[in-house]
Amino acid sequence: GPVPPSTALRELIEELVNITQNQKAPLCNGSMVWSINLTAGMYCAALESLINVSGCSAIEKTQRMLSGFCPHKVSAGQFSSLHVRDTKIEVAHFITKLLSYTKQLFRHGQQFN
């Protein structure tokens, strides 16, 4: 699948920061999503998890960005083997973990798809 260019990663990082900065109230009314393995294929896995959250404008741009990073079409209810299917976490925690790992990838120039 396509590897996100560094500019696209930068835009994702900036958006993840935008929706978490100084945020203490639960994102998306405290919705829970499946945790994922932050490894190769993480963008598709992240999208598969977040796409099940509907009606949350705060993460709509993130969902669109992730869909651009994922080579296949993802729809609600679709899960890959990349999910740690026994753990659900709050959207805010999920976004924070995704941000932290995406920054690591950006710093080290490893843009896994």
Partner: antibody
């Protein structure tokens, strides 16, 4: 020692320009979001603007009274923050502080740490 | 533009509890930060993210938040706590910072 040292203040005429600098040491400046805060004589603190770390986008935000006139920039290779002030007005007269931005502390490696400079005085008068 | 509202002054006797409030429409979703500024000095962070205390700040300083109001509490105020106190937060976007007008704390010695 963790510190910020501002310089570049002085007396300038209305409509003039000035560039303030803030030299950082003792912490990882490149990971820090940085702010400028000012305090007019006998008044309270006023947020001027901030710049994110490069990894977090390097974007800037400004308070309404200075937007379009002031520009915040950074040079991570020199551990230095800048505030370019154009079209200065008498109401811009204040002590200007640079500081680590607490909102950005969550993303940097200075969480729970607070660093302010000693301030540099800018006087706008004819 | 977004505003944070503080009382101009609060007075207590030494050993009493001082409470300084800060109100703002975005505070239910955005953290508050509190700074102490003594005359002629740069501000010092005493509380971050509503209720966390930086290292080196005495335990008598605490913070809380409920709804649109954040509160700085100084339990057993001391003469050296006399200073101006400012709350700081952001607008609902998180992009624009704002300070309250400041509260002058007087500890009647």
């Amino acid at each position: 020692e963790v510190q910020l040292v501002e310089s570049g203040g002085g007396l300038v005429k209305p409509g003039g320009s000035l560039r303030l600098s803030c030299a950082a040491s003792g912490f990882t400046f490149s990971n820090a979001w940085m702010s400028w805060v000012r305090q007019a004589p006998g008044k309270g603190l006023e947020w001027v603007g901030r710049i994110r770390s490069e990894i977090d986008g390097g974007t800037t935000n400004y308070a309404a009274p200075v937007k379009g006139r002031f520009t915040i920039s950074r040079d991570d290779s020199k551990n230095t923050l800048y505030l370019q002030m154009n079209s200065l007005k008498t109401e811009d007269t204040a002590v200007y502080y640079c500081a680590t931005d607490q909102v950005g502390a969550y993303y940097g490696d200075y969480y729970g740490m607070d660093v302010w400079g000693q301030g540099t005085t800018v006087t706008v008068s004819s | 533009s977004y505003e944070l509202t503080q009382p101009p002054s609060v007075s207590v006797s030494p050993g009493q509890t001082a409470r300084i409030t800060c109100s703002g429409d975005a505070l239910p979703e955005k953290y508050a930060y509190w700074y102490q500024q003594k005359s002629g000095q740069a501000p010092v962070l005493v509380i971050y993210e509503d209720s966390k205390r930086p290292s080196g700040i005495p335990e008598r300083f605490s913070g809380s938040s409920s709804g649109t109001m954040a509160t700085l509490t100084i339990s057993g105020a001391q003469v050296e706590d006399e200073a101006d106190y400012y709350c700081h937060s952001t607008d609902s976007s998180g992009n624009h910072g704002v300070f309250g007008g400041g509260t002058k704390l007087t500890v009647l010695g």
